[in-house]
């Protein structure tokens, strides 16, 4: 599927099949500075046995032979979902008992930044991204990813934990943004809409994609994520849409089987490992890369946000499991899951091709009206 | 620390069977896949079948499947290896192995001779 | 035949480097599969010395390390020492076979 108004060599379409679709023009006036109050807001987390405080559970990194699932959360608070929102607010809601991160969810009072200050950060995530905007950065180099194919066993544990469905990822799933750029992946989980109602986090000249997948990595400077929080480059989030497409895609159907099995929030299963990278892209090549900060409380800034230009395309059915299996908190369905669109407040986002480049007949010249920032090499 | 202890190996005639066993300790037993591998006399390593920590999920190497059945007592801290319709290239010793990264802890190994 | 393949013995002196290749396809080592490297003394159970390519758990000497390139995979031991003659089996997991796979083994002696 073609996002509207694209051209033939756009950004962001052709799932693993490989074609490039386009993230569209981007010649539209600016809205970063009025995010979205029919977005709700969104949550991502990190891996471990407890849930970390917010967009992702940030585990411990810990030696590799260790227990099957060897990275070990910090003793952060858990996160609660909303209940399910009609329509997707701007606030997250958190228990009345609980003034910390650990009780949140999607809709509702108190406003995020009572929850953690940094949600009122100048620097949020997610973005509307605009590809003319974008700044095409020859030193953007292909992703490079080790490791992510895993054999069946260790078996991996894929939770509910309330507030999306998340993959515990072990020690050894290495990706590099560029040379010394190195993080290790730590876990990955799923945004998601609700019946004909698209649910993606990042959205492309205002289009919200079906769905949205983050793989969250922390880097080899840190050892632990709370060491990372809030540090520039710390974390590192790869983010891919996910689109409706015609076929069933198999890499996704060994989760997505297994909902049904983990459809009470906080239960978990174990699944046998897989080819992690087979549920991304296949172009590592193409992506937008911007700094921001985790979906959900406690927000923490200095998150390296990726995101690939190509989608990944998921049967209508599978869509459908995606958001119509699992269970919140409060006997409500677990939909809606992302976070409003946040002003860019003068960022820049980069791409590693030139997106603004329109080779539809509308444009008679290129045009570009953002230089990257880092020099090409 | 950790340890795996083997025992169930001997002499069995073709077409019979034998149960192998691997008793845990030092670890949590539950969280771990499994695995057996096994070395038939100046041979190399083979391996010959896994199971998750749930014991949930099996697999086997073509060479043994339908014949031999890996399975697991979490409450008891142990792993198994049923052995049927043995032959005679199935001699070897036979290893357990606790399958994290790579098969980090072996047993001491059990000789299993089918023979007449 | 193994799906990996080693050749069957290296030698070395002692203090010197020796490297053991294991060589796969594109199904298993290609694939971007982790490969583990185990040493076996004569007489005793095969012990971890590399996992997932290049980490060596605790205890292991730094003499050991690996790497992987493509659909082939190596085994450095620098500063040879006499304890080390023993067998050295590479592994990895096979998409195809859908089996964790060995390669053949190599024996290295300590001259």
């Known amino acids: 599927q073609r996002l509207p108004r694209m051209q033939e060599d756009s950004p962001l379409g052709g799932g693993s099949s490989g074609e490039d679709d386009p993230l569209g023009e981007e010649d539209l006036p600016s809205e970063e500075d009025s995010p979205r109050e029919e977005d709700p807001p969104g949550e991502e987390d990190l891996p471990g046995e407890e849930d970390l405080p917010g967009e992702e559970d940030l585990p411990e990194v810990k030696p590799k032979s260790e227990e099957e699932g060897s990275l070990k959360l910090e003793d952060l608070p858990t996160v609660e979902a909303p209940g399910d929102p009609q329509e997707p607010q701007n606030n997250a809601h958190r228990d009345k008992e609980g003034d910390d991160q650990s009780h949140w969810r999607y809709g509702g009072d108190p406003p995020w930044p009572r929850v953690s200050p940094a949600c009122a950060g100048r620097f949020q995530s997610p973005v509307d991204i605009r590809p003319q905007l974008a700044a095409f950065c020859p030193a953007l180099r292909p992703l490079e990813l080790l490791g992510f194919q895993l054999p069946p066993l260790p078996e991996l544990r894929l939770r509910n934990n309330g507030h999306s469905v998340q993959l515990t990822l072990p020690p050894g799933l290495e990706m590099a943004l560029g040379p010394g750029r190195e993080y290790r992946a730590l876990q990955l989980h799923l945004h998601w809409g609700a019946a004909g109602r698209p649910g993606s986090e990042h959205t492309v000249e205002g289009h919200r994609f079906p769905a949205e997948i983050h793989v969250v990595h922390l880097s080899t400077a840190f050892a632990r994520v709370d060491e990372a929080l809030g540090r520039p480059g710390g974390l590192a989030v790869l983010a891919a849409f996910l689109e409706e497409g015609p076929e069933e895609n198999s890499a996704y159907e060994q989760l997505l089987s297994r909902l049904e099995e983990i459809a009470e929030e906080g239960s978990e299963t174990q699944v046998p490992g897989l080819d992690i990278s087979a549920l991304l892209p296949s172009d590592f090549s193409r992506y937008f890369q911007y700094e921001g900060s985790l979906t959900t409380p406690p927000c923490a800034q200095g998150v390296i946000w990726t995101v690939f230009n190509q989608t990944v395309m998921l049967s209508a059915k599978q869509l459908h499991t995606l958001s119509d299996t699992l269970w919140g908190p409060g006997d409500s369905r677990l939909q809606l899951n992302f976070r409003a669109t946040q002003p860019l407040n003068g960022r820049v986002i980069e791409a590693s091709f030139p997106a603004g480049v329109d080779s539809s007949p509308r444009a008679a010249e290129p045009v570009q009206l953002n230089s990257c920032l880092a020099a090409g090499d | 620390q950790v340890q795996l202890v083997q025992s169930g190996g001997g002499l069995v005639q073709p077409g019979g069977s034998l149960r192998l066993s691997c008793a845990a300790s030092?670890?949590?037993?539950?969280?771990?896949?499994m695995s057996w591998v096994r070395q038939a006399p100046g041979k190399g390593l083979e391996w010959v079948s896994a199971?998750?920590?749930?014991?949930?999920?099996?697999y086997y190497a073509d060479s043994v499947k339908g014949r031999f059945t890996i399975s697991r007592d979490n409450s008891k801290n142990t792993l198994y290896l049923q052995m049927n319709s043995l032959r005679a290239e199935d001699t070897a010793v036979y290893y357990c192995?606790?399958?994290?990264?790579?098969?980090?802890?072996w047993g001491q190994g059990t000789l299993v001779t089918v023979s007449s | 035949q193994s799906v990996l393949t080693q050749p069957p013995s290296v030698s070395g002196a002692p203090g010197q480097r020796v490297t053991i290749s294991c060589t796969g396809s594109?199904?298993?080592?290609?694939?971007?599969?982790?490969v583990h490297w185990y040493q076996q003394l004569p007489g005793t159970a095969p012990k971890l010395l590399i996992y997932?390519?290049?980490n060596r758990p605790s205890g292991v000497p730094h003499r050991f390390s690996g790497s992987k390139s493509g659909t082939s995979a190596s085994l450095a031991i620098t500063g040879l020492q006499a304890e080390d003659e023993a067998d050295y089996y590479c592994?990895?997991?096979?998409?195809?076979?859908?089996?964790?796979?060995f390669g053949g083994g190599t024996k290295l002696a300590v001259l």
């Open positions: 594109s199904s298993n080592i290609g694939r971007g599969y982790n």
């Open positions: 592994q990895s997991y096979d998409s195809s076979l859908r089996a964790w796979v």
């Open positions: 199971i998750s920590g749930s014991g949930g999920s099996t």
């Open positions: 192995a606790r399958a994290a990264a790579g098969f980090d802890y």
């Open positions: 997932d390519d290049t």
């Open positions: 030092g670890f949590t037993f539950s969280s771990y896949a």
